[in-house]
């Protein structure tokens, strides 16, 4: 009897109520491999969630945020509120980063800004609440007579990951 | 898929200086913070540092400021950590690894390591 | 800067429940990251922000976070889960922002 359950491809289960025939999954139920003995429910995006892709017979639904959210966990098992860029989401909610620090994301937490010292450069453009300060020649390369510097084109910042 | 290759194992005398470098591929590099741990033997793991591959700005734990240099090559998509006045407490593994897209969440990948080996 | 206190070890049968904790100040005021580490082997990263599982990591393994301590708990444990633990927050108020605890051994018995 097991061998003959084996047989069912994805998208079936093997209905013991019927001899071990393959019945095809009922609506809003799938089956990703063979053998399944039953399907499972499809995943529902209601909510802050959204749905990024149906549900098939082989595959579950999966699901995304509505704007002003982002995921959190594997198959985004959760949805967090986003917050402004220059602040930092703590457990009581949105809040400006402090005096030194900046996130240029909607979502983490406020990131000290670059000490330009360390690498021997000096600051050319202050850091703000949504950016980190930019660094430019060390100061000894700023003396009289240094020719002037040229700040660095922009480039994308480093952003959001997919999930 | 994202991966992170790293130099080969070095043995640096003390008072040397050793350059680790970590390719990355599978992604785009200037995107993503990337940041160097380490692993002493029979020890913990301990933050070094980070650089934004975009801009090259760094920030260093205190123990390592004046000693230790992040850089990057955008261009071959590598990092780099050049650690100097090597002593034989900075015999370790050395990891990089890439912070996924925003500051605060956990490191997502890793490299496979690289063992320095300090000794006289 | 910032504490994280770890035991240095723990033991449990296989099946069991194993529970690593992290103690610090204030710990559920922040985010609270996991990472699972072998011999000769990059770490992993088990659990982010408190209580995410990235993809690929066993529904097994969850976390915790509040008050002072924060907790990984494995259930029905296997052998391929002995390693080491270590858990890791960001402290962008000091100038060591990135802040290990000391580890904890996962030990099965048998």
């Known amino acids: 009897l097991q061998d003959l359950c084996s047989n069912c491809p994805a998208g079936t289960f093997c209905d013991n109520n019927r001899s071990q025939i393959c019945s095809p999954c009922p609506p809003n139920s799938f089956s990703s491999a063979g053998g399944q003995r039953t399907c499972d429910i499809c995943r529902q995006c209601k909510g802050v969630f959204k749905t990024r892709k149906e549900c098939s017979s082989t595959s579950n639904a999966e699901c995304d945020c509505i704007s002003g959210y982002h995921c959190l966990g594997a198959e985004c098992s959760m949805c967090e509120q986003d917050c402004k860029q220059g602040q930092e989401l703590t457990k009581k909610g949105c809040k400006d980063c402090c005096f030194g620090t900046f996130n240029d994301q909607k979502r983490g937490i406020c990131r000290p800004w670059t000490n330009c010292s360390l690498d021997g450069k000096s600051v050319l453009v202050n850091g703000t609440k949504e950016r980190d300060v930019v660094c430019g020649p060390s100061p000894a390369d700023l003396s009289p007579g240094a020719s002037s510097a040229t700040p660095p084109a922009p480039a994308r910042e480093p952003g959001h990951s997919p999930q | 898929q994202v991966q992170l290759v790293q130099s080969g194992a070095e043995v640096k005398k003390p008072g040397a200086s050793v350059k680790v470098s970590c390719k990355a591929s599978?992604?785009?590099?200037?995107?993503?913070?990337m940041h160097w741990v380490r692993q002493a033997p029979g020890q913990g793991l301990e933050w070094m540092g980070w650089?934004?591959?975009?801009?090259?700005?760094?920030n260093y734990a205190q123990k390592f400021q004046g000693r230790v240099t992040m850089t990057r090559d955008t261009s071959i998509s590598t990092a780099y950590m050049e650690l100097s006045r090597l002593r034989s407490d900075d015999t370790a593994v050395y990891y990089c690894?890439?912070?996924?897209?925003?500051?605060?969440?956990?490191?997502?990948?890793w490299g496979q390591g690289t063992l320095v080996t300090v000794s006289s | 800067s910032y504490v994280l206190t770890q035991p240095p070890s723990v033991s449990v049968a296989p099946g069991e429940t194993a529970r690593i904790t992290c103690g610090g100040d204030?710990?559920?005021?922040?985010?609270v990251h996991w990472y699972q580490k072998k011999p000769d082997q990059a770490p992993v990263l088990v659990v982010y922000?408190?209580?995410y599982r990235p993809s690929g990591i066993p529904e097994r393994i969850s976390g915790s976070n509040s008050g002072n301590t924060a907790t990984l708990t494995l259930s029905r444990v296997e052998a391929g889960d002995e390693a080491d633990y270590y858990c890791?927050?960001?402290?962008?108020?000091?100038?060591?922002?990135?802040?290990f605890g000391g580890g904890t051994q996962l030990i099965i018995l048998g």
């Open positions: 690894a890439r912070e996924p897209g925003y500051y605060g969440s956990g490191l997502d990948y």
């Open positions: 599978g992604y785009t590099f200037t995107g993503y913070y």
């Open positions: 650089i934004n591959p975009n801009s090259g700005g760094t």
């Open positions: 204030d710990i559920g005021d922040k985010r």
């Open positions: 922000e408190d209580r």
């Open positions: 890791q927050v960001w402290d962008s108020s000091s100038d060591h922002p990135g802040v």
